[in-house]
Every structure is written in structure tokens, then in C-alpha cells.
């Protein structure tokens, strides 16, 4: 969308935006819309909040449609009530080491963050706090019913997840990628988030990319087994096109998407890579993204809580991501 | 009530400017975009400008955008037209609308000031 | 975009029905999918009043006798029953791209 046409903007009066969102007018100044937060997609229709120093970095000048919302060089970070500056390391709590880097928080885990899948040793892990200890440990319960562990047994798959090393040194550099950022969004189009110093001038930038945990049209519930509790993986249909403000993926995508459960764990992404799609835009623009691709996710009990300032903002973390 | 009164109309020789007012009332101001239309002697009716709530766009005719430029004071609830190098063909009644930026354009109008462009 | 109006004179007796027409040059469709077609009204010695917006979207306090039509580049303004105080000039309107214009009018008068 250019700016050139007539100013015409949503029937409904202007938005009421959440507190600390500002009010301001889109990027062809035309219609009062709700600031784009840090992180978030940003258009030209959709702008990033000028109060808080943000602005859309659409990546190469090729993809100047929809970018992500960034702070200035040098920006600080409000984390936890805290003002980091640009570059500075700090532990959130015993669990994570984390950089700021212009606006952006990454963190790296301290804890194994393993998602443990049941296993013939072990076929009810669960993670626990154990006192005096700041990191939660597996422990295996012994089943409540010991006839479901046996012929069960061949369908419990044993699941390693690879995250990145961070000790990796090359070339007078100490190589440090944070986690991906879980996705923004539970559903539909989200970004997803890392900082990483793996370049050749050895500089800490921020990376992102597009991520869909789920479709939000799929009513997944509806597709769990009669005596299941959850639906991992589900199927797709059929071959779908992604979309992405107004724009559709050039290729159709056979992608994997994550389940749901109704006995109040959450499904996640478990392993994932990152692969580059092309959408095209009503004015025939092509755009490449990168965007996070499945590859297994996890269901689980340990799902966002409001005890850990990290694991409510950022869980949940994608691990082994085959880039 | 609703109210749009214009003001700043009046006689001008040909090169002459000058700069029209139109003060609103009965509304919050701030939360509309304003226009300019005219209307020559026994003609029809041809936009002229508009402006965005807070001033920071605006589009207009593009055979009048070096010689017409239109303005808004949210303090003082008032849309300005300045006119400067005026023509015989400049001439006609400038109403001033509230345009509403959403479903219709001109759903209040003034009652119009003439301009006449005469030597 | 020109609006071109048909006919610019329309007699008509009180109660009758009237019909005016609007083409325009080329598709009035707006980026955003809306049609922005307007219809307005100038009674002698006023100023102009709108009677519909977006095709056929009646203002507030437009009898309900006005009806609007059409789409892409052809519309039409309905008057059912024709009163003597919908005598005027009546004149279509696209905001869907610049230069805003407004068609050369039809003026409504008793025959």
C-alpha cells in the first residue's frame, strides 16, 4: 500500500490502545492506529512507537514491506524493572544469562532446559524444584497404573534436543546465540527473536524471524483421540500458504504444526529450523523472510508461569534449531 | 450544534492573496480531518484540499498545490486556506467541510465565503 | 476520475419517482476495498448536504424515500416519491482516488 491514494481509515472510531501504547498516525499519516511494541511486525500502515525510540527495520532494502519493530543503536533495556545499557551481560535470576542489545533482551538458559519425552526407564518425567537448588530437575513417578506402561511402550520415542553450544570459539571470538525467543503469537503469524555475535566482525546483532505455532482458524481439540488427552502434532490436511500482511507465500508448505491438550499442558515446539520464504505482495513485490519450520513439538506441564520474570515473557524457548 | 463558520472572503486584484478562516463549533474538533470546496459563479462544485487531524497531511488539487496551501490550529478549532497568486478563475464561494476521514467525506458544511478575483 | 452525470436536467412532478445516474471513468474502488460514492444535495441558495456515502449508505436524518445504487463504474441515485423540498442540484461525488471530484450535477425541478 502506498501513500499516494485518498486518506480513508476503519469505520470503527480510533483504537483505545493498552496502557504505555501510543496513539499515533499510520506511516502515510492518515488513520490513528495503536503503536507497533517492540518485536512486533511493522508496515508502513502499521508503525513502531516513536515515543519509546522504536523503528520498523525492514532488513535488506529489497523487503521494505513488513519488518520488525527495533530500537535505535544503542538503545537500553527495561527488563524486570531494570535499566540495562546497550552490550551489558546481566543474570535475570540463577536460570539466565542475558544481553541487552539496542532495546532487545536475549538470554541464554543456565539450566538444561530439555523437554524429556517418556521413555521405557522413564515413563512420567516431571520437572521439580528441589530445595537449596536453582535449577529444576527430572525426576521419573512411578505410574499409577502399571497396566498402561506395557504395551504403551512402542509408541514413547526417546528425544534429544540440540541447542546451540556457547562456548564455541573461532577466530579470536567467543560465539554466543541465544535461545529463539518463543513465538510471539500462540497462534497465526508471530516473530521469534535471538541474539547472536555469530558474524564475521564478532558483533552482537539481533536476528528474527516468522514463526506460526498454530493456525488460529484450526479448531485442533476437535481432531484428539477418543481416551487422549493431546494432540501432538496434528496432521495438515493439506499443502497451506502462508500469509503475512496482505502478502502470500509464493510456495505452498506442507508445515508441522503444534497441538494442543486438554488436561492443561501445553504443546511447543520441541525441534525446529529456519528456512527462507518468499512472499508476494497485491503489487507484485517479493519479499523473502526467514521463518521458523517445525520439525517436533513437545507437550508438557511446563508451561509459561508468573514466578520467573524470563520464563513469563520469553517461554517458551525453541531448542535444536537446525539453522 | 454542529457549526462551521467562513471568513476571509472578499475582493482581490489578480496576483493578490488571501488567507480564508473557518472556525468549528459543537464538535471535537481534533478527531476530524477538514476540506475546502468551491463553487465558481453558476458552476458545480471541485474540491480544493484536506487536511489530517493534527496537520501533518495534506493533499491537494494538484493544479492549485504552488499556489494554495491549507493549515489547522486544534487550539483554536480553525482551518486555514491560503491563497496567494490569485486568478480571475479562483473565483467562487470557498465552503469549508468537516470531512469525518472514515465512512463519508462532507457530512457538515459551512455556508460559504465569496471570493472575488477582479481587477 | 470524471463523473459524468445523466441527465443534467431532470422534470419531474411531485410523488413521481426520480433517477439520476453517475459513471465514471474508470473503477472508483479504493485500496481498501471501499467504494467511496457520495451523493449530495444543493438546495437553492445553501450550501451543499450529503445524502449518501459509500454507495448506498443513507446520512442521518436522509428520509428513507433517497436510495443508492450501483458498483465499479455505475451508479444511480433513487428518489422514490419525489417532495418539493428534494428540489436542487444533486451531485455525485468519488473519494476513492485524487483528484476528488464531483460530477457536473442534475438539477431536479418540478415539470
Known amino acids: 500500500q502506498n501513500c499516494s491514494g485518498p486518506c480513508r481509515c476503519p469505520d470503527e472510531p480510533a483504537p483505545r490502545c493498552p496502557a504505555g501504547v501510543s496513539l499515533v498516525l499510520d506511516g502515510c499519516g492518515c488513520c490513528r492506529v495503536c503503536a507497533k511494541q517492540l518485536g512486533e511486525l511493522c508496515t508502513e500502515r502499521d508503525p513502531c512507537d516513536p515515543h519509546k525510540g522504536l523503528f520498523c527495520d525492514f532488513g535488506s532494502p529489497a523487503n521494505r514491506k513488513i519488518g520488525v519493530c527495533t530500537a535505535k543503536d544503542g538503545a537500553p533495556c527495561i527488563f524486570g524493572g531494570t535499566v540495562y545499557r546497550s552490550g551489558e551481560s546481566f543474570q535475570s535470576s540463577c536460570k539466565y544469562q542475558c544481553t541487552c542489545l539496542d532495546g532487545a533482551v536475549g538470554c541464554m538458559p543456565l539450566c538444561s532446559m530439555d523437554v524429556r519425552l517418556p521413555s521405557p526407564d522413564c515413563p512420567f518425567p516431571r520437572r521439580v524444584k528441589l530445595p537449596g537448588k536453582c535449577c529444576e530437575e527430572w525426576v521419573c513417578d512411578e505410574p499409577k497404573d502399571q497396566t498402561v506402561v506395557g504395551p504403551a511402550l512402542a509408541a514413547y520415542r526417546l528425544e534429544d534436543t540440540f541447542g546451540p553450544d556457547p562456548t564455541m570459539i573461532r577466530a579470536n571470538c567467543l560465539v554466543q546465540t541465544t535461545e529463539w525467543s518463543a513465538c510471539s503469537k500462540t497462534c497465526g503469524m508471530g516473530i521469534s527473536t535471538r541474539v547472536t555475535n555469530d558474524n564475521a566482525s564478532c558483533r552482537l546483532e539481533k536476528q528474527s524471524r516468522l514463526c506460526m505455532v498454530r493456525p488460529c482458524e484450526a479448531d485442533l481439540e476437535e481432531n484428539i483421540k477418543k481416551g487422549k488427552k493431546c494432540i501432538r502434532t496434528p496432521k495438515i490436511s493439506k499443502p497451506i500458504k502462508f500469509e503475512l500482511s496482505g502478502c502470500t507465500s509464493m510456495k505452498t508448505y506442507r508445515a508441522k504444526f503444534c497441538g494442543v491438550c486438554t488436561d492443561g499442558r501445553c504443546c511447543t515446539p520441541h525441534r525446529t529450523t529456519t528456512l527462507p520464504v518468499e512472499f508476494k505482495c497485491p503489487d507484485g513485490e517479493v519479499m523473502k523472510k526467514n521463518m521458523m519450520f517445525i520439525k517436533t513439538c513437545a507437550c508438557h506441564y511446563n508451561c509459561p508461569g508468573d514466578n520467573d520474570i524470563f520464563e513469563s515473557l520469553y517461554y517458551r524457548k525453541m531448542y535444536g534449531d537446525m539453522a | 450544534e454542529v457549526q462551521l463558520v467562513e471568513s476571509g472572503g472578499g475582493l482581490v486584484q489578480p496576483g493578490g492573496s488571501l488567507r480564508l478562516s473557518c472556525a468549528a463549533s459543537g464538535f471535537t474538533f481534533s478527531d476530524y480531518y477538514m476540506a475546502w470546496v468551491r463553487q465558481a459563479p453558476g458552476k458545480g462544485l471541485e474540491w480544493v484540499a484536506n487536511?489530517?487531524?493534527?496537520?501533518?497531511?495534506?493533499d491537494l488539487l494538484d493544479s492549485l498545490k504552488s499556489r494554495f496551501t491549507i493549515s489547522r490550529d486544534n487550539a483554536k478549532n480553525s482551518v486555514y486556506l491560503q491563497m496567494n497568486s490569485l486568478r480571475a478563475e479562483d473565483t467562487a464561494v470557498y465552503y469549508c467541510?468537516?470531512?469525518?476521514?472514515?465512512?463519508?467525506?462532507?457530512?457538515?458544511w459551512g455556508a460559504g465565503t465569496t471570493v472575488t478575483v477582479s481587477s | 476520475v470524471v463523473m459524468t452525470q445523466t441527465p443534467l436536467s431532470l422534470p419531474v412532478s411531485l410523488g413521481d419517482q426520480a433517477s439520476i445516474s453517475c459513471r465514471s471513468s474508470?473503477?472508483?474502488?479504493?485500496?481498501?476495498?471501499?467504494?467511496?460514492l457520495e451523493w449530495y444535495l444543493q438546495k437553492p441558495g445553501q450550501s451543499p448536504q450529503l445524502l449518501i456515502y459509500k454507495v448506498s449508505n443513507r446520512d442521518s436524518g436522509v428520509p428513507d424515500r433517497f436510495s443508492g445504487s450501483g458498483s465499479g463504474t455505475d451508479f444511480t441515485l433513487k428518489i422514490s416519491r419525489v417532495e418539493a423540498e428534494d428540489l436542487g442540484v444533486y451531485y455525485c461525488?468519488?473519494?476513492?482516488?485524487?483528484?476528488?471530484?464531483f460530477g457536473q450535477g442534475t438539477k431536479l425541478e418540478i415539470k
Open positions: 487536511i489530517n487531524y493534527e496537520g501533518s497531511r495534506t
Open positions: 467541510a468537516r470531512d469525518t476521514s472514515r465512512g463519508s467525506y462532507f457530512d457538515v
Open positions: 474508470q473503477s472508483i474502488v479504493h485500496y481498501n476495498g471501499n467504494t467511496y
Open positions: 461525488f468519488q473519494g476513492s482516488h485524487f483528484p476528488l471530484t
